[in-house]
Interface confidence: medium
């Protein structure tokens, strides 16, 4: 199988006329050693190919998890999950954007463009980097959490003497605390402007309120539709 | 109004292959999220997942029959088709289609079932 | 797979009583369950998905309850068409598994 051939992520399917959103399976891969992996592809929004690596918008998962799960990933994917920052730093490898969606309680919409997304590997503590950001959604709320390792409730990389997994109920890229906590718990219409370990995005309604619905997706740079 | 029915052979011969029609109205299999399922159930016995297939041709099995069973679609006659073979007589039973929509696989509206005895 | 166990096997109750179904997951699949209702000679029924969202036209008094492996159906007062078989669903991952039924029939 040459490299053109390789079906490596959602892109690779869409330039392979998958052009219906919806759930596909990759195939293993011996030569980048990655696993089969089913992933949730959107083939629509602003010419398609993203692989979607997180998702919230039914609260029937919790996200207040452990390094491991965090690592393999978690949840139903074809509802809220995680992709698994072992699969997530694989897909990155490569020059990669990020595209952050949100809606409010209200159905408005915003969204967040990262020009460059990488996490680093397991040794690295699954460490985020991202580049230019653009999009709608009030002020980069991801932008203090750049450069910053992945924390769970059982392992601490945050830069702070609280432990901000612990406080913010999620894994995440803590800093000391959060600007943004897109792994925060799931908090209902009535519940979901009253705490601060909601899922929150401070840059557009402030911290403490929680959010309907997110999702987390990449594509490569080089994306052409 | 939302309806499912299935059609296909009363009774089939073991070894022979099975082909079972679901038709439904009231919904379209183009529609993001939507898909149609198989259901069996052996008299007096529990319901059995047998396959399913989404808008986007999103294939799924039962892995301990996925050798045996090929399930297709044609969206715009809206009705889906899935076809078993080498049937034994254990695969007596009856089938049911069932509409899964949304995002969490169930199934929320069904048809009525269609008996299926395999006898020689 | 996620095997699916639900008990009792069968349950005899009386009009007006509360009765309580349980299903219990052999892996945790947070709150993906279904609960199914069916009528002999009749297809199975949706009543409750996610858990605990009662299917639109579902009367009130069916309830359900849990989250990871153990889950349950309620019904707060039986009524005559309450006695049927019973089946759990996860609705997690593929492959989709039914737990065995409960059968509720008239003491």
């Known amino acids: 199988q040459t490299s053109a051939d390789a079906i490596y992520d959602c892109s690779s399917l869409y330039q392979k006329n998958y052009r219906i959103s919806g759930v596909y399976r990759l195939p293993s891969n011996d030569f980048l050693g990655s696993p089969e992996l089913e992933v949730f592809c959107d083939m629509e929004t602003k010419g398609g190919g993203w692989t979607v690596i997180q998702r919230r918008k039914s609260g029937l998962v919790s996200f207040y998890r452990d390094w491991k799960q965090y690592k393999q990933g978690f949840g139903s994917i074809r509802g809220d999950f995680w992709l698994g920052n072992e699969h997530i730093h694989r897909l990155s490898r490569q020059p990669t954007r990020l595209r952050v969606e949100m809606e409010d309680w209200e159905g408005t919409v915003r969204y967040a463009e990262y020009s460059h997304f990488v996490l680093s590997n397991e040794l690295n503590s699954y460490r985020l980097f991202l580049g230019n950001y653009s999009g709608n959604a009030g002020n980069d709320a991801l932008y203090y959490h750049n450069n910053t390792a992945f924390s769970t409730k059982d392992k601490d990389n945050d830069n702070c003497l609280d432990k901000c997994a612990q406080l913010r109920k999620g894994g995440y890229w803590y800093n000391c605390c959060t600007d943004s906590n897109l792994n925060g718990v799931y908090y209902r219409l009535g519940e979901h402007d009253k705490h601060l370990d909601g899922i929150t995005w401070y840059g557009w309604h402030g911290a403490n309120y929680s959010l309907k619905r997110v999702e987390m997706k990449i594509r490569p740079e080089d994306f052409k539709p | 109004q939302i309806t499912l029915k299935e059609s296909g052979p009363t009774l089939v011969k073991p070894t022979q292959t099975l082909t079972l029609t679901c038709t439904f109205s009231?919904?379209?299999?183009?529609?993001?999220?939507?898909?149609v399922g198989w259901i069996r159930q052996p008299p007096g016995k529990a319901l059995e997942w047998l396959a399913l297939?989404?808008?986007?041709?999103?294939?799924r099995y039962s892995p301990s029959l996925k050798s045996r069973l090929t399930i297709t679609k044609d969206t715009s006659k809206n009705l889906v088709v899935l076809t078993m073979t080498n049937m034994d007589p254990v695969d007596t039973a009856t089938y049911y289609c069932?509409?899964?929509?949304?995002?969490?696989?169930?199934?929320?509206?069904w048809g009525r079932g269609t008996p299926v005895t395999v006898s020689s | 797979d996620i095997q699916m166990t639900q008990s009792p096997s069968s349950l005899s109750a009386s009009v007006g009583d509360r009765v309580t179904i349980t299903c219990r997951a052999s892996?945790?699949?947070?709150?993906?369950l279904a609960w199914y209702q069916q009528k002999p000679g009749k297809a199975p029924k949706l009543l409750i998905y996610?858990?605990?969202s009662l299917q639109s036209g579902v009367p009130s008094r069916f309830s359900g309850s849990g989250s990871g492996t153990d889950f349950t159906l309620t019904i707060s007062s039986l009524q005559p068409e309450d006695f049927a078989t019973y089946y759990c669903?996860?609705?997690?991952?593929?492959?989709?598994?039914f737990g065995g039924g409960t059968k509720l029939e008239i003491k």
């Open positions: 297939i989404y808008w986007n041709d999103d294939k």
């Open positions: 069932a509409r899964d929509y949304g995002d969490y696989w169930f199934f929320d509206l």
């Open positions: 892996q945790g699949i947070s709150s993906y």
């Open positions: 009231g919904f379209s299999l183009s529609t993001s999220g939507v898909g």
């Open positions: 996610a858990a605990s």
């Open positions: 669903q996860q609705s997690f991952s593929t492959p989709l598994t």
